[in-house]
Amino acid sequence: KSEMPQPVSIQDINHRVWVLQDQILIAVPRKDRVSPVTISLISCRHVETLEKDRGNPIYLGLNGLNLCLMCAKAGDQPTLQLKEKDIMDLYNQPEPVKSFLFYHSQSGRNSTFESVAFPGWFIAVSSEGGCPLILTQELGKANTTDFGLTMLF
């Protein structure tokens, strides 16, 4: 198990990258002037206390920005949010911090990120460009939940 966050770049199957705009993550087509965020991911160190066979439980942060992805309810709907948080503080906690955890599943080159706090809800981007990242239960419909990860060293 890694004890240092792994920097990765993420894009969806339509080659859109994640960009930070006004403290919101949006997916935009990769262009010359676009500067995508680098994502840090680290496995939860309490993996034995989480569900088996659902994927690798990970924390997702924005590299160098002290911001992490988390899921919280807005009304009765889970939403994806960015919270000011050091990813290593989450990693070191004595229990899994489920609101910040995602099950990372890989199938070939495709990755999905399912909320641990809200099973069945996945990080997604709308099929239209320039939209914020969201959580969805609707797989493979109007939203894209499959992403490609490139390890950065």
């Epitope: 206390t49 503080d89 004595p94 229990e95 911090v97």
Partner: antibody, heavy 121, light 109 residues
Framework: QVQLVQSGAEVKKPGASVKVSCKAS????????IYWVRQAPGQGLEWIGR????????RYDPKFQGKATLTTDTSTSTAYLELSSLRSEDTAVYYC??????????????WGQGTLVTVSS | QAVVTQEPSLTVSPGGTVTLTCRSS?????????ANWVQEKPGQLFTGLIG???DRAPGVPARFSGSLLGGKAALTLSGAQPEDEADYFC?????????FGGGTKLTVL
């Protein structure tokens, strides 16, 4: 408001088993961890273990592995502690507590009122 | 298994300051022990005061603060009130298990 209400006092014979309940209200039991702690007469607190009610995974203090069994029934928002092969030294007040993450750390924010288990022949 | 030791009893004057400590038999307490402090008043439910060494639980008065002091976890009460008379327990994390101290009986006199 948030409450953890435990079952009433029990008197058991050595070798018997006991099951203590802890009913949660005012919050979704699946959104937190439930811890069990005991306090023997005149002693400090002792951690028994914890359960994640959402998925049923448990952690136990090594001393209570095989002695205590933690379960939950999420349909009734109730956590259970079962103790087997009781001995006189298991006489104690048993507490459930919510261990919740709030912003930056985990805290024991709410506790049950305690259940006295007396083991006597 | 680690043993966690607290002062059995302490006395503080109303308005005064007192520090309760929590020592580990395995060596210096660090932030990795994620010290928790809980309060038990006679006839009342336990209340969580501090988590993660120095984070006050929501609703806990600012006169309670947690820290590390000389290799021990510490709970400092500044401006003690009569209602702060209670038993105080610390708990330290050791990898995947939690160990409580024996408690400190605090008298406000």
């Amino acid at each position: 408001q948030v409450q953890l209400v435990q079952s009433g006092a029990e008197v058991k014979k050595p070798g018997a088993s006991v099951k203590v309940s802890c009913k949660a209200s005012g919050f979704n039991i699946k959104d937190t961890y439930i811890y069990w702690v005991r306090q023997a007469p005149g002693q400090g607190l002792e951690w028994i273990g914890r359960i994640d009610p959402a998925i049923g995974t448990t952690r136990y203090d090594p001393k209570f592995q095989g002695k205590a069994t933690l379960t939950t029934d999420t349909s009734t928002s109730t956590a259970y502690l079962e103790l087997s092969s009781l001995r006189s030294e298991d006489t104690a007040v048993y507490y459930c507590a919510r261990y919740d993450y709030s912003g930056s750390s985990f805290y024991f924010d709410y506790w049950g009122q305690g259940t006295l288990v007396t083991v006597s022949s | 298994q680690a043993v966690v030791t607290q002062e059995p009893s302490l006395t503080v004057s109303p308005g005064g300051t007192v520090t309760l400590t929590c020592r580990s038999s395995t060596g210096a307490v660090t932030t990795s022990n994620y010290a928790n402090w809980v309060q038990e008043k006679p006839g009342q439910l336990f209340t969580g005061l501090i988590g993660g060494t120095n984070d006050r639980a929501p609703g806990v008065p600012a006169r309670f603060s947690g820290s590390l002091l000389g290799g021990k976890a510490a709970l400092t009460l500044s401006g003690a009130q009569p209602e702060d008379e209670a038993d105080y327990f610390c708990a330290l994390w050791y990898s995947n298990h939690l160990v409580f101290g024996g408690g400190t009986k605090l008298t406000v006199l």
